[in-house]
């Protein structure tokens, strides 16, 4: 990734589960802002193993890595660690714009793949071209993640690469989903890893002059049961005109079988809450996740009475999660008028 203005990896939302390394090229003097985790519970940023302070020219603060003006000494490996754990949320290398290293992680400028170079002398045994990409040997990733191991190498003649798992030739034929062997990128990619993928993975790089090898140790962590996770921002606050149709969406993620209800908050005797402190609600829809379109609440031909707060409630054997949104209904005759709706409420 090369940018002429500010480098911004992604907004501060929930991180991707994929922990693949990234390499970003940053021009000298350029500001950098990288995000990791939600702002209020953002991960901790580390540079070359040392945690970044929340103040200073280069700082790690509320999940953000901020560099006011990129200098040569800012280049290096940055990791973002989930608070209170060793789970890697971001793993990236910042390099200066004039660096010879490719900004694309899947390209290898030193791999000497020019055929005219293949038989030129002197011959050279294989060597690692990017050992900094191979610093981490012990890996532990959650089941379902994608794992990518790389062993970028060069030599003369151009070496070949093959992969072993637990000392045996590995082609992925017995693995559901198979594997991707990208020889030009010196990489092995396994998608949706499962516990049976645990093991020692060896890249063996050879040419006529010699061979080198490197071991990666992979552990796959089985997902621990949790209550349903609801996608942030859904359902969303919505404004509609009387007589129109409305769809409220709720995306539910759950390993255990979830049960979903759509609720509308109502007022009884002038009160929104009962004596027990719980809100008065009307159950509009209830079903299991495998029911068709249970994650969508359809409201046809809405009227002013349909305005109000709607909640998507999801539960499984572990617990409950819910998120709410407001529907504002405008009169037909004045579609340009908009009412400010309260913000959607989210729960962890």
């Amino acid at each position: 990734l090369e940018a002429s203005e500010e480098v911004e990896l992604e907004p501060c939302l929930a991180p991707s589960l994929e922990q693949q390394e990234q390499e970003l090229t940053v021009a000298l003097g350029q500001p950098v802002r990288l995000c990791c985790g939600r702002a209020e519970r953002g991960g901790h940023w580390y540079k070359e193993g040392s945690r970044l302070a929340p103040a200073g020219r280069v700082r790690g603060w509320r999940g953000r890595l901020e560099i006011a003006s990129f200098l040569p000494e800012d280049a290096g490996r940055y990791l973002c660690l989930a608070r209170g754990s060793m789970i890697v949320l971001q793993n990236l290398t910042l390099i200066t714009g004039d660096s010879l290293t490719s900004s694309n992680d899947d390209e290898d400028p030193k791999s000497h793949r020019d055929p005219s170079n293949r038989h030129s002398y002197p011959q050279q045994a294989p060597y690692w071209t990017h050992p900094q990409r191979m610093e981490k040997k012990l890996h532990a990733v959650p089941a379902g993640n994608t794992v990518k191991f790389r062993c970028p190498a060069a030599g003369n003649p151009t070496p070949t690469i093959r992969w072993l798992k637990d000392g045996q030739a590995f082609h992925g034929e017995n693995r559901i989903g198979g594997i991707r062997l990208r020889h030009q990128h010196w990489s092995l990619v396994m998608e949706s890893v499962v516990p049976s993928d645990r093991g020692t993975y060896t890249c063996l790089v050879e040419n006529a002059v010699g061979s080198i090898r490197y071991n990666y140790l992979l552990d796959v962590l089985e997902r621990s049961p949790h209550r349903p996770i609801l996608q942030a921002g859904l359902p969303a606050n919505t404004t509609a005109v009387v007589g129109s149709d409305v769809e409220l969406l709720c995306k539910v993620y759950s390993d255990a079988q979830p049960h979903i209800q759509w609720l509308k908050h109502i007022v009884i005797n002038g009160s929104s809450f009962g004596a027990d402190g719980f809100p008065y609600v009307q159950v509009l829809k209830t079903a299991d996740i495998n029911s068709s379109e249970v994650e969508v609440l359809y409201l046809r031909n809405v009227s002013a009475e349909d305005a109000g707060e709607y909640t998507c409630l999801a539960g499984n054997s572990i617990g409950l999660s819910y998120q709410s949104a407001w529907l504002t209904v405008l009169p037909e005759e004045d579609p340009t008028w908009t009412a400010a709706a309260p913000e959607a409420r989210y729960t962890d």
Epitope: E48, G49, L79, E135, K136, L138, A140, R198, N215, L217
Partner: antibody, heavy 120, light 111 residues
Framework: EVQLLESGGGLVQPGGSLRLSCAAS????????MGWVRQAPGKGLEWVSV????????IYADSVKGRFTISRDNSKNTLYLQMNSLRAEDTAVYYC?????????????WGQGTMVTVSS | QYELTQPPSASGTPGQRVTISCSGS????????VHWYQQLPGTAPKLLIY???QRPSGVPDRFSVSKSGSSASLAISGLQSEDEADYYC????????????FGTGTKVTVL
Amino acid sequence: EVQLLESGGGLVQPGGSLRLSCAASGFTFSHYWMGWVRQAPGKGLEWVSVISPSGGLTIYADSVKGRFTISRDNSKNTLYLQMNSLRAEDTAVYYCARSSGWALDAFDIWGQGTMVTVSS
Amino acid sequence: QYELTQPPSASGTPGQRVTISCSGSSSNIGSNIVHWYQQLPGTAPKLLIYGNNQRPSGVPDRFSVSKSGSSASLAISGLQSEDEADYYCASWDDSLKAFYVFGTGTKVTVL
């Protein structure tokens, strides 16, 4: 405070068995690779074994393979080393250690050690 | 058995610079990060420095490392009496199977 505390050492006859424990506290035990390192009296450090966070992957030094078994109970934050068919050359202080990704897979936290003596 | 070779001893007077070498092979130091441990008399080892001069908190920058090919070295500048200890280099090794290997250890004496 991040801490590792070994126990279970003692005197055992050749051919006997012993089980070492290592209680971890102050960090999320289930996220870390853990290992055992030993040191014979007056000698240097020797790596013994390592186990992955889930316990599903274990690796041993050739000198103990087939005789020692490393395991863990993440619900109890405890690491174990089951030592069978003990020999005189297994006499050493046994250290439990945490391997950290931030320290590029080095052992960044060590216990105080427990002494194992194999003698008739 | 030890795959990494260190000199058995090194010494210096306070304020001097002492260097400890660590020699390995392409399957360990040549391909992997080198870790250095300090063991003060009668105590457990502690991680001193690793990788490209990365130190756990509390380790002074008097300790520095370098690596070239299959060899590495640890330098202690401005030697102090509290530096008297055993020092071990270590690395993962990729010959045939993965394992971790320590150096033979170097006893540093402050004269």
